[in-house]
């Protein structure tokens, strides 16, 4: 949609075990209301109040890895857009249902 | 026992936007375990689902509709409310409101209104 | 979206027989399906939820088996009052959550 960008990324995603799975709360950000953004979570993809990024611009190094195969979901959320909204050294790549915050290969 | 009601004009014309409105009672639309949906049924046909909403107002929208709907929440209330804007004839149908556990063990629609005939006429 | 086809369009029963309703998925959708029984003039009503667990209320004639793509609802020995359409409806996933066509429950 022709909507400007929500500010900040989604928060890191919980590594404990989801005991109860949930239906998906939203589909995209703009499915959330106010500055929230529609994020994975332990149990789903819920609507999250975003984490600041610093220097959101800036384009790290390496390329990103090839996709294959066809995403079943319809309208898959961004969690993030730019590299400088990932963590570390990952870069924010298209992968197969939509873009995400991978590990570069070697250029 | 809870209880689902809609309310809203019985006939819109083309083009314009179709506006309805469920009220819950005897339980809370503030519970985290449901999800609040529109259904429809268009005349001797099966039926459609439209969409749900949350009770923090977050919406999950059928994406054959998406365009034109759009469904809100009023805790306050105990209600939320279907849009489905510039409506034709394939529009005409009846409109149930409904109840559906936000968990994929609690699945399916557990509670639904009476149904509201909309028809779309000029 | 998830595509379900439900078999036959009509089945014909007389009172007290046993009745089999079928219901195909378009691509696996686990155990994330429910029934629903639905009169003239009434909203529909949840009998299965899971694919075999009976909603609250529902008598224990009603029930559901099958996983993936291929569904089956059973009634054991049909009451007068259980002919009507039933549908069956997916939630697996994504969605848009869909609907089978229904198939028509009437006396023979």
């Known amino acids: 949609s022709g909507k400007s960008f929500k500010a900040g990324v989604c928060p890191p995603k919980k590594s404990a075990q989801c005991l109860r799975y949930k239906k998906p709360e939203c589909q995209s950000d703009w499915q959330c209301p106010g500055k929230k953004r529609c994020c994975p979570d332990t149990c789903g993809i819920k609507c999250l109040d975003p984490v600041d990024t610093p220097n959101p611009t800036r384009r790290k190094p390496g390329k990103c890895p090839v996709t294959y195969g066809q995403c079943l979901m319809l309208n898959p959320p961004n969690f993030c857009e730019m590299d400088g909204q990932c963590k570390r050294d990952l870069k924010c790549c298209m992968g197969m249902c939509g873009k995400s915050c991978v590990s570069p290969v070697k250029a | 026992q809870v209880q689902l009601q809609e309310s809203g004009p019985g006939l819109v014309k083309p083009s314009q936007t179709l506006s309805l409105t469920c009220t819950v009672s005897g339980g809370s639309i503030k519970s985290g375990d449901y999800y609040w949906s529109w259904v429809r049924q268009l005349p001797g046909k099966g039926l459609e689902w439209i969409g749900y909403?949350?009770?923090?107002?977050?919406?999950y929208y059928n994406p054959s509709l998406k365009s034109r709907v759009t469904i809100s929440i009023d805790t306050s209330k105990n209600q939320f409310s279907l849009k489905l804007s510039s409506v034709t004839a394939a529009d005409t149908a009846v409109y149930y409101c409904?109840?559906?556990?936000?968990?994929?063990?609690?699945?399916?629609?557990?509670?639904w209104g009476q149904g509201t005939l909309v028809t779309v006429s000029s | 979206e998830i595509v379900m086809t439900q078999s036959p369009t009509t089945l014909s029963v007389s009172p007290g027989e046993r009745a089999t309703l079928s219901c195909r998925a378009g691509?696996?959708?686990?155990?994330?399906l429910a029934w629903y029984q639905q009169k003239p003039g009434q909203a529909p009503r949840l009998l299965i939820y899971g694919a075999s667990t009976r909603a609250t209320g529902i008598p224990a004639r009603f029930s559901g088996s099958g996983s993936g793509t291929e569904f089956t609802l059973t009634i054991s020995s049909l009451q007068s009052e259980d002919f009507a359409v039933y549908y069956c409806q997916q939630y697996n996933n994504w969605p848009p959550w869909t609907f089978g066509q229904g198939t028509k429950v009437e006396i023979n």
């Open positions: 909403i949350y009770y923090s107002g977050s919406t």
């Open positions: 691509q696996s959708v686990g155990n994330n």
């Open positions: 409904a109840r559906e556990g936000s968990y994929y063990d609690s699945g399916g629609f557990d509670y």
